[in-house]
């Protein structure tokens, strides 16, 4: 029963041109070349795109048009390989443009970089950049998909197209504003720190898709759609997975014309559906097309159905659950998990794939026993431990959280984690620890109900960070196992490792802890981040460093740049100070 | 709305067949194990069978052999196929749904009943 | 098959009486048990199911209990709309079901 229209196109060029309209249609192309090709100039891509447009415009003029018949892999990689510096500018990525589709585009997907070689994006003064934004508002708002496309490869494109509209009328109000900082940043504000959480929850998708698969991604979404939209029945939970997936996948494979187009046929349905699917979704509809996909994607759960049995007498108690299984073994588990996970908006979809997981390891030894059915009847004692650890981690946790505020919260995460994995590039540690440290003023406030959900698969988002970036320059077999063996069981592999006894800890270097003037006139963000870098540091040259000794040297850390900052010679200061600094750091710690 | 609707009922001769359909409206019957239960005039309740949503049917007992359940998703339509039918087989015929895809009980939603007689 | 064996098969009450109803397995079925009532020409109601649990909707006076092999439904204060004929339904234990006879619950 999907929603997508099959039918066949003489030129796909000039359908999704169609569908989409000329505005969305440059724009997703746009993004899709900035994914691509991460470092080229903003001039190089909007002259790409343009003739990319104007090529699909004669192909709407008459469909059988020379090379419109051409599949979009095929028109769009053809684009790419006309950059004049691509082998000087990519290298190797130079070489998928000897290759045909579909092995090219396979190639470019490849090369994507997750952490590409750009300058921070640096915020210019408001007046300057509504005078940017007044000046050529369409280029403006092109910039701003370009430089977020191509610093996040793998963002959902149609979720960007939504980001850029509330840019420009960010910018729309505030430049008119009689105060337009005040009116301006805070939104800016808000849309970064949305847009990266947007962007690390699409990375998780696209993992999930390209290295563990189709399955492992609708079983997610079976079980997020089922705790979603409890009162749908499975075929209409089994019917959106599939379009989902579909939607992901494609989006996740840079074909970002169909995923949005898909996107948007999907919101479609579930919104002339939302009887049968959710009651929560119609305010959602009542939105425009982009605001309507963005809502229902974050739509509430919708109550659990009255008078829902229990799931014993079905998958547990019944001597035929080892026929029901053989005989139909994906609509079975399929059926478990979409029952365990409507029954349960308090675990977290991790869990719940967890225990789905479980459920089946027993019914595929039990039902090669003597007596299944004595084999397999205790199977739900098996979830008790399984639900338990989770739990127990975040009551643990939020209390750490609560006792120590934020950043003192992430910096405990900073030294567990450094002594779990020391091997880690400091940045890669720092930015995860960080993030993981953000649990706790995100979901610590919720009531038990919802803590879990929220803290665990957002534990699994900032997770994955860590193993993309470590798949780009792997230098630790723990990080590799554990993001590698099974994709539900990150956050718990991660959560169990110990100390790493076989490291041998950094060589003091006393240059690592200088620190200068400039530190003065950092934000406070920015100056927590020096401070935790310095921490992780700390940690990889003296790794049995007890939390006392760290504690006391951090707090002299902080003295001393609050001294210095305050101080009429700043440099001076830090000079004489950082050297003092330096040496009782390392008495301290026996260095 | 959701309601399930029997049909085919009527009257048949000792040893003919009959075929009952349930037809599904307001939900799809792919997600339910459905169930063909029968009412004797003036007796209890029997179960016939059922359809999972594995598409693995089971009977009762005494129902094996003689009748078949089965299903078009397409149609949204259950059926319940009687041969050899007999006088005793005379009742009143209700398709019932499970609770989930796997369900033998218990039954929420019931349809009006279709009758059959068998005499000649 | 689970054999389902309710009793009475019939009884007699006046409203506002207390009414209970028995339902014994053949064998164990945890709390596999569903109480239905029943009304000429009409198709059964769902009251009670998993022994203890009320459906939606059905008033707070019927009440179910038991687990295993022996159930009780029972009705607190009789109600005119509540004479019909209730049946037991032990389910869960396999794919197949069975019903009780039922009892016919008439005005005294």
């Known amino acids: 029963r999907g929603v997508f229209r099959r039918d066949a196109h003489k030129s796909e060029v000039a359908h999704r041109f169609k569908d989409l309209g000329e505005e969305n249609f440059k724009a997703l192309v746009l993004i899709a070349f900035a994914q691509y090709l991460q470092q080229c100039p903003f001039e190089d891509h909007v002259k790409l795109v343009n003739e990319v447009t104007e090529f699909a415009k004669t192909c709407v003029a008459d469909e059988s048009a020379e090379n419109c018949d051409k599949s979009l892999h095929t028109l769009f990689g053809d684009k790419l390989c006309t950059v004049a510096t691509l082998r000087e500018t990519y290298g190797e990525m130079a070489d998928c443009c000897a290759k045909q589709e579909p092995e090219r585009n396979e190639c470019f997907l490849q090369h994507k970089d997750d952490n590409p070689n750009l300058p921070r994006l640096v915020r210019p003064e408001v007046d300057v950049m509504c005078t940017a934004f007044h000046d050529n508002e369409e280029t403006f708002l092109k910039k701003y998909l370009y430089e977020i496309a191509r610093r996040h490869p793998y963002f959902y494109a149609p979720e960007l197209l939504f980001f850029a509209k509330r840019y420009k009328a960010a910018f729309t109000e505030c430049c008119q504003a009689a105060d337009k900082a005040a009116c301006l940043l805070p939104k800016l504000d808000e849309l970064r720190d949305e847009g990266k959480a947007s962007s690390a929850k699409q990375r998780l998708k696209c993992a999930s898709l390209q290295k563990f698969g189709e399955r492992a991604f609708k079983a997610w979404a079976v079980a997020r759609l089922s705790q979603r939209f409890p009162k749908a029945e499975f075929a209409e939970v089994s019917k959106l997975v599939t379009d989902l997936t579909k939607v992901h996948t494609e989006c996740c494979h840079g074909d970002l014309l169909e995923c949005a187009d898909d996107r948007a046929d999907l919101a479609k349905y579930i919104c002339e559906n939302q009887d049968s699917i959710s009651s929560k979704l119609k305010e959602c509809c009542e939105k425009p097309l982009l605001e309507k996909s963005h809502c229902i994607a974050e739509v509430e759960n919708d109550e659990m159905p009255a008078d829902l049995p229990s799931l014993a007498a079905d998958f547990v108690e019944s001597k035929d659950v080892c026929k029901n299984y053989a005989e139909a073994k994906d609509v079975f588990l399929g059926m478990f998990l979409y029952e365990y996970a409507r029954r349960h908006p308090d675990y977290s979809v991790v869990l719940l794939l967890r225990l789905a997981k479980t459920y089946e390891t027993t019914l595929e030894k039990c039902c090669a026993a003597a007596d299944p059915h004595e084999c397999y009847a205790k199977v739900f004692d098996e979830f008790k431990p399984l639900v338990e650890e989770p739990q127990n981690l975040i009551k643990q946790n939020c209390e750490l959280f609560e006792q120590l505020g934020e950043y003192k919260f992430q910096n405990a995460l900073l030294v567990r984690y450094t002594k779990k994995v020391p091997q880690v590039s400091t940045p890669t540690l720092v930015e995860v620890s960080r993030n993981l440290g953000k649990v706790g003023s995100k979901c610590c406030k919720h009531p038990e109900a919802k803590r879990m959900p929220c803290a665990e698969d957002y534990l699994s988002v900032v997770l994955n960070q860590l193993c993309v970036l470590h798949e780009k320059t792997p230098v630790s077999d723990r990080v590799t196992k554990c993001c590698t063996e099974s994709l539900v069981n990150r956050r718990p592999c991660f959560s169990a490792l110990e100390v790493d006894e076989t490291y041998v800890p950094k060589e003091f270097n006393a240059e690592t802890f200088t620190f200068h003037a400039d530190i003065c006139t950092l934000s406070e963000k920015e100056r927590q981040i020096k401070k935790q870098t310095a921490l992780v540091e700390l940690v990889k040259h003296k790794p049995k460093a007890t939390k006392e000794q760290l504690k006391a040297v951090m707090d002299d850390f902080a003295a001393f740049v609050e001294k210095c900052c305050k101080a009429d010679d700043k440099e001076t200061c830090f000079a004489e100070e950082g050297k003092k600094l330096v040496a009782a750091s390392q008495a301290a710690l026996g260095l | 709305e959701v309601q399930l609707v029997e049909s085919g009922g009527g009257r048949v001769q000792p040893g003919g067949s009959l075929r009952l359909s349930c037809a599904a409206s307001g939900f799809s019957l792919s997600s339910y194990a459905m169930n063909w239960v029968r009412q004797a005039p003036g007796k209890g309740l029997e179960w016939i069978g059922h359809i999972n949503a594995g598409d693995i049917a089971y009977y009762a007992t005494w129902a094996k052999g003689r009748f078949t359940i089965s299903r078009d998703n397409s149609k949204n339509t259950v059926y319940l196929q009687m041969n050899s039918l007999r006088a005793e087989d005379t009742a009143t015929y209700y398709c019932?749904?499970?609770?989930?895809?796997?369900?033998?009980?218990?039954?929420?939603?019931w349809g009006q009943g279709t009758q059959v007689t068998v005499s000649s | 098959d689970i054999q389902m064996t309710q009793s009475p098969s019939s009884l007699s009450a006046s409203v506002g009486d207390r009414v209970t109803i028995t339902c014994q397995a053949s064998e164990s079925i945890n709390s596999r048990l569903a109480w239905y009532q029943q009304k000429p020409g009409k198709a059964p109601k769902l009251l009670i199911y998993d022994a203890s649990d009320l459906t939606s909707g059905v008033p707070s006076r019927f009440s179910g209990s038991g687990s295993g092999t022996d159930f009780t439904l029972t009705i607190s204060s009789l109600q005119p709309e509540d004479f019909a004929t209730y049946y037991c339904q032990g389910y869960g234990g396999s794919s197949t079901t069975t019903f009780g006879g039922g009892t016919k619950l008439t005005v005294l």
């Open positions: 019932a749904r499970g609770a989930g895809g796997f369900s033998t009980g218990p039954f929420k939603l």
